[in-house]
């Protein structure tokens, strides 16, 4: 959570002289309350936009827009404090609009915008616009808050941003999975243009259940340059468990730009339309124990075998 680096932050508009300042998120009016305070913002609108930094990186930013109520309290409006709170980390960033001239009623509703909060993919935020000065203790609140969920890197708009490209967002593996006879799955995907290894993580589930009945990890060595963008085919042998028929295949790349934290892609094979009466699945010990990271699988090839080749 940061401010876009190179922009001269401007909030002036016809009829208003205004400057944007960094804020500690603790406006002076908290400590020294005023008798007359403005009403709250009327409508806050937030959307996602993409901007470039002075280093030429494309970053996701929040575009915040709000309007004023058409009441006499605008005569006492001295500015606004914009605050963005990242919900998980509790990190907060604020800026202050400082009005250098008095607001007057004019033929259009006053509208303000700010598009300089740089945010992270797949994170949740609360945006608050607080009119200044803040109200006296027990006074009516004069702020409004809205939540915003920044999409993850699979979202079309986010794919092209620098943080997403660094985690491998441009790679489209176009995974296909087909069920073969003799309890086998054939997985095919497109390799990226980097000499890096991949892992295929197979998790199988009973029909209509969310707890796994089989897990298997398969390692794919780094392809040679002539194999870049080619299809890689892998045949995985499943555990012979009746009813363990829904298979999720996840492919984890290890690109140099993101190492263990690259975006994973997955595909799912559903159970057959008319499953047999499922037999009870025996208690099953996972083949891997989740640790604290996001790529916590360990190989155990004696429980399910596999082989692969790259196809040109």
């Amino acid at each position: 959570l940061r401010l876009l680096d190179h922009r001269a932050l401007v909030c002036s508009q016809p009829g208003l002289n205004c400057t944007v300042k960094n804020s500690t998120c603790l406006d002076d009016s908290w400590i020294h309350p005023r008798n007359l305070t403005p009403s709250s913002p009327k409508n806050i609108y937030i959307n996602l936009s993409v901007s470039s930094t002075q280093h030429g990186e494309l970053v996701p930013v929040l575009h915040v827009e709000w309007t004023l109520q058409t009441d006499a309290s605008i005569l006492y409006l001295e500015g606004a404090e914009l605050s963005v709170l990242q919900l998980n980390t509790n990190e907060r960033l604020c800026v202050r609009f400082e009005f250098l001239s008095k607001l007057r009623h004019h033929h259009r509703r006053w509208r303000f915008t700010f598009s300089h909060f740089v945010v992270d993919p797949d994170q949740e935020y609360e945006v608050t616009v607080h009119h200044l000065p803040k109200p006296i203790p027990d006074g009516d609140p004069n702020h409004q808050s809205k939540n915003f969920l920044v999409p993850d890197c699979e979202h079309a708009r986010m794919k092209v941003t620098t943080p997403c490209m660094s985690s491998g967002s441009l790679w489209d593996p176009n995974i296909t999975v087909e069920t073969l006879e003799a309890h086998q799955l054939r997985v095919s995907f497109t390799l990226w243009n980097e000499s890096t290894h991949y892992q295929i993580l197979l998790t199988s589930f009973p029909h209509m259940e969310n707890h796994s009945c089989f897990e298997h990890m398969h390692h794919i060595p780094a392809p040679r340059p002539e194999e870049f963008h080619q299809r890689s085919n892998v045949t995985l042998t499943l555990r012979n468990l009746k009813g363990c028929c829904r298979h999720q295949v996840q492919i984890q790349p290890f690109f140099s730009s993101c190492l263990n934290d690259c975006l994973r892609h997955s595909a799912t094979v559903s159970c057959p339309e008319m499953p047999d009466t499922p037999e009870p699945i025996p208690d099953y010990m996972p083949l891997w124990e989740p640790r604290s990271g996001s790529s916590d699988y360990k190989d155990d090839d004696d429980k399910g075998s596999s082989h692969h080749h790259h196809h040109h």
């Epitope: 409508n43 919900l87 998980n88 949740e124 939540n147």
Partner: antibody, heavy 116, light 107 residues
């Protein structure tokens, strides 16, 4: 594979407290918040609040303020929800779920029955 | 708090047909809407967030239209595994609130 596994069913008397646990695996607990949602028998879903395992910050629904406490233990990747002064209308399935806005992975639910 | 209203309460559809579920918010929530699917005895599953972004692993037959106060979840061709209860949820402001649900049953 992200999984949230909750503790087993509980039967409690009115006025008692219940503490439901939610063990996370397949991801780092501190990377996302944990929300708690309940569902009375045959009813809809009701949001109770959330906790950030990263910061310890909490936000509770006003209805449960003063009666609920959400905590986490990062060493065991477990989140907890304690509800006190139980009443018969607290009988419900209690779910933990990952994230604070759109809840992307859910636990299997814990049935809490409040009956004298 | 924002009240979410879903209609119809029950929708009877034949497999292969299109299902259209409606969700209305009592005030504008922009695109801050999620849809969940719940089957008997199971936890809800996230289908869509941001009013139109499908969650990981959710098939393309699920789509949402709308922003502001009116939203529609469309299932283009119902499969047997799609018969369930569907809830909408707003996350625009606290508290998070859910609709009462729409049960999609086999005709």
């Amino acid at each position: 594979q992200v999984q949230l596994v909750q503790s087993g069913a509980e039967v409690k008397k009115p006025g008692a407290s219940v503490k439901v646990s939610c063990k996370a695996s397949g991801y780092t607990l501190t990377s996302y918040g944990i929300s708690w949602v309940r569902q009375a028998p045959g009813q809809g879903l009701e949001w109770m609040g959330w906790i950030s395992a990263y910061s310890g910050n909490t936000k509770y629904a006003q209805k449960f303020q003063g009666r609920v406490t959400m905590t986490t233990d990062t060493s065991t990747s477990t989140a907890y929800m304690e509800l006190r002064s139980l009443r018969s209308d607290d009988t419900a399935v209690y779910y933990c779920a990952r994230r604070q806005l759109a809840l992307d992975y859910w636990g299997q639910g814990t049935l809490v029955t409040v009956s004298s | 708090e924002i009240v979410m209203t879903q209609s119809p309460a029950t929708l009877s559809v034949s497999p292969g047909e299109r299902a259209t579920l409606s969700c209305r918010a009592s005030q504008s929530i922009s695109s801050n809407l999620a849809w969940y699917q719940q089957k008997p005895g199971q936890a809800p599953r996230l289908l869509i967030y941001g009013a139109s972004t499908r969650a990981t692993g959710i098939p393309a037959r699920f789509s949402d239209n709308g922003s502001g106060t009116e939203f529609t979840l469309t299932i283009s061709s119902l499969q047997s595994e799609d018969f369930a209860v569907y809830f909408c949820q707003q996350y625009d402001t606290w508290p998070l609130t859910f609709g009462g649900g729409t049960k999609v049953e086999i005709k």
